[in-house]
């Protein structure tokens, strides 16, 4: 015997209180598949969350984050604070990248500068808190007599220590 509820389309639920007829989902709820016995509560995009897509009777709302924050987690379940380039988010808030590390985005962690010498190359452009070093040609590739493009080691920035 076919389940009468299987005829209920998305946007409705099979109402046991009314002889299993298909009733529309009430306001603030949805059903994304047919044959549902209840409708799910719509997600609320409030506070730090903004509505990217309104809830409908057949699909949940979708949220993103208010300016200064970015989405984390499946379906933007959390909003994390943006930091400036050259910083990373810690439990104490945004902190500058330590010397020898950089972050070129408003999110994520500070990463170590590329070690050019591991590839047998020299440093063409020094790294900063916001940018990785740029590696140049290996010293052997330089023509004889050409001046080295390796700049002097950068001075230690005050308040920063190697990780």
């Amino acid at each position: 015997l076919q389940d009468p509820c299987s005829n209920c389309p998305a946007g409705t639920f099979c109402d046991n209180n009314r002889n299993q007829i298909c009733s529309p989902c009430p306001p603030n709820s949805f059903s994304s598949a047919g044959g549902q016995r209840t409708c799910d509560i719509c997600r609320q995009c409030k506070g730090v969350f903004r509505t990217r897509k309104e809830c409908s009777s057949t699909s949940n709302a979708e949220c993103d984050c208010t300016p200064g924050f970015h989405c984390l987690g499946a379906g933007c379940s959390m909003c994390e604070q943006d930091c400036k380039q050259g910083q990373e988010l810690t439990k104490k808030g945004c902190k500058d990248c330590c010397f020898g590390t950089f972050n070129d985005q408003k999110r994520g962690i500070c990463r170590p500068w590329t070690n050019c010498s591991l590839d047998g190359k020299s440093v063409l452009v020094n790294g900063t808190k916001e940018r990785d070093v740029v590696c140049g040609p290996s010293p052997a590739d330089l023509s004889p007599g050409a001046s080295s493009v390796t700049p002097p080691a950068p001075a230690r920035e005050p308040g920063h220590s190697p990780q």
Epitope: P26, I41, R43, Q44, K46, C63, F69, M78, Q81
Partner: antibody
């Protein structure tokens, strides 16, 4: 099970600053809103303001110029500071968890037991 | 003065059904779900109904909520003496970007 506990002085002099801390135990302070709500004697519940775990804040417009809410996720605590208090700020102050937004929909679902703050000289 | 309007008092006898109303505006109840709380003297409010008509686990089905337009109501059937408490409605207010509350309804169980 998450529990909230308010702490701070029960008596504050007029024009001074009211400072309260809420300690969250039995769960993480991450991914929720953390709220201060007050209830003057025999009066209505009033939202003071809230902070999201990652630092977003929103304050009641009537108190905005005097209130600061901060959070320390490493200590699982959040705090309320209310400046230039008057007798009208005498109330029971509740800290509470709010899961509204994100994927939550309960709203303010866990409350501290409340702490009475009297403003008097 | 509260943003949501509730009657200050309501009463009923044991076994009766009582309804408490809550009136708001388009920026709160009209556009957002309603929560209901009960508060016993000297204690914190406890969530009774969320999202208009949903009961958290442990709340008996004697308590039900509904919403229409910019008004909401809480119904308590089979009234019991332990239901005597203050009942508050709450809704998110888009203009204030936060929760607003009613001033509470004191429910008295007679007899």
């Amino acid at each position: 099970q998450v529990q909230l506990q308010e702490s701070g002085p029960g008596l504050v002099k007029p024009s001074e600053t009211l400072s309260l801390t809420c300690t969250v135990s039995g769960g993480s302070i991450s991914s929720y809103y953390w709220t201060w709500i007050r209830q003057p004697p025999g009066k209505c519940l009033e939202l003071v303001g809230y902070i999201y775990y990652s630092g977003y804040t929103s304050y009641n417009p009537s108190l905005k110029s005097r209130v600061t809410i901060s959070i320390d996720t490493s200590k699982n605590q959040f705090s309320l500071q209310l400046n230039s208090v008057t007798a009208a700020d005498t109330a029971v102050y509740f800290c509470a968890r709010d899961d509204y937004g994100g994927n939550g929909y309960y709203g303010v679902d866990v409350w501290g037991q409340g702490t009475t703050v009297t403003v008097s000289s | 003065q509260s943003v949501l309007t509730q009657p200050p008092s309501a009463s009923g006898t044991p076994g009766q059904r009582v309804t408490i109303s809550c009136s708001g505006s388009s920026s709160n109840i009209g556009n957002n779900p309603v929560n209901w709380y009960r508060q016993l003297p000297g204690t914190a409010p406890k969530l009774l109904i969320y999202s208009n008509n949903q009961r958290p686990s442990g709340v008996p089905d004697r308590f039900s909520g509904s919403k229409s337009g910019t008004s909401a109501s809480l119904a308590i059937s089979g009234l019991q003496s332990e239901d005597e408490a203050d009942y508050y409605c709450a809704a998110w207010d888009d203009s204030l970007n936060g929760w607003v509350f009613g001033c509470g309804t004191k429910l008295t169980v007679l007899g």
